[in-house]
Interface confidence: low
Amino acid sequence: MAQAKINAKANEGRFCRSSSMADRSSRLLESLDQLELRVEALREAATAVEQEKEILLEMIHSIQNSQDMRQISDGEREELNLTANRLMGRTLTVEVSVETIRNPQQQESLKHATRIIDEVVNKFLDDLGNAKSHLMSLYSACSSEVPHGPVDQKFQSIVIGCALEDQKKIKRRLETLLRNIENSDKAIKLLEHSKGAGSKTLQQNAESRFN
């Protein structure tokens, strides 16, 4: 009888202990769930900073290459360029890197998608019109909205194979390129209108080692 009581006590203790372990485990799991939310928030915030940096650099570039810059005095232009270069320098001091975790297939898809965009970028100087329509078809392949033109099916299947974060980056890059091409078009039309000449103003260098 005494032995039975002892066993019961031991079992009770063991039960209490495993109950508190489960409790502790669920609390830790809860903490990790909350941390996961914060980690994702951190990544989103860093990505937002990364995007803001890209946008700022693009805006500085577009100011430096705007038509207005051509229609002011050399002294003013020099002063504005100095300010723009200073701002660019300050922007470039911000280093943000959000690494995307990819499996080998996603890695391959990203490489392939990047190669396709680079190919189009390298054609910019030869044929702006063609490059624009090509980029539009690539962009349509990334867009969830109803496409306004032909969709590059091959590119679409490649992009679908990319990590979600990479898909967003690819879409953003294409948006930037299309914006730049738009600006190029305007600059060319303005130049053709003013002196019948063409200009190429797309800032996209696959080998820019010094910038």
């Epitope: 290459n65 270069n85 660019m88 970028v121 800032q203 260098n205 820019s208 910038n211």
Partner: antibody, heavy 122, light 112 residues
Framework: QVQLVQSGAEVKKPGASVKVSCKAS????????FYWVRQAPGQRLEWIGY????????TYNRKFKGKVTITVDKSASTAYMELNSLRSEDTAVYYC???????????????WGQGTLVTVSS | DVVMTQSPLSLPVTLGQPASISCRSS???????????LHWFQQRPGQSPRLLIH???NRFSGVPDRFSGSGSGTDFTLKISRVEAEDVGVYYC?????????FGGGTKVEIK
């Protein structure tokens, strides 16, 4: 065809400044960057710096910071290099060379100007 | 700065014979983008340097095929298969991977 034509030889007194020009033709001026290189007597070639005519952004060799200013005039398809506070050690032939292609590979010293001899002597 | 060391300093050659110039860099010239920006130039007496080979082994347009470049990492070679009279001059290697770009001290090729 691609041509880079530099301004003529200069003789300057110590302490003075000199501005060397390099006019480009035969290609789209803003598509390639510009390098400046010097060759002093008995010395190896030295890279001074470069400028990107597209946005006038430039980078200098640490050794020449404060000594050199590189600029461009897009309307004249011309790059300039100004040397200030000249000393006898600045006596050299100064070359401009076409830099890298902004839209991909290529470029990188593929065409050179004929050189400008700058002599600093009292 | 990356130091480029060329050898020999002087290279007397017989017309029609091969010639070889070595160039060594103080650090690897492989850029993070995968390219190796090692170039070779020829400077004839009284002339500007002229690009012969770019990115280790690519002959520039108009350069005779007797000129070839090879190498990787830190060790590179320029070869002239059969030297001609017009090949006389100073040959320079140059790296454009790291800032600032730097040049070798030159190798003077002369006819024996």
């Amino acid at each position: 065809q691609v041509q880079l034509v530099q301004s003529g030889a200069e003789v300057k007194k110590p302490g003075a400044s000199v501005k060397v020009s390099c006019k480009a033709s035969g290609y789209s001026f803003t598509d390639y960057t510009f390098y400046w290189v010097r060759q002093a007597p008995g010395q190896r070639l030295e890279w001074i710096g470069y400028i990107d005519p597209y946005n006038a952004g430039n980078t200098y060799n640490r050794k020449f910071k404060g000594k050199v200013t590189i600029t461009v005039d897009k309307s004249a398809s011309t790059a300039y290099m100004e040397l200030n506070s000249l000393r006898s050690e600045d006596t050299a032939v100064y070359y401009c060379a076409r830099g890298y292609y902004r839209y991909g590979g290529g470029g990188d010293f593929d065409y050179w100007g004929q050189g400008t001899l700058v002599t600093v002597s009292s | 700065d990356v130091v480029m060391t060329q050898s020999p300093l002087s290279l007397p050659v017989t017309l029609g014979q091969p010639a070889s110039i070595s160039c060594r860099s103080s650090q690897s010239l492989v850029h993070s983008n995968g390219n190796t920006y090692l170039h070779w130039f020829q400077q004839r007496p009284g002339q500007s340097p002229r690009l012969l080979i770019h990115k280790v082994s690519n002959r520039f347009s108009g350069v005779p095929d007797r000129f070839s470049g090879s190498g990787s990492g830190t060790d590179f070679t320029l070869k002239i298969s059969r030297v001609e009279a017009e090949d006389v001059g100073v040959y320079y290697c140059s790296q454009n991977t790291h800032i600032p770009p730097t040049f070798g001290g030159g190798t003077k090729v002369e006819i024996k």
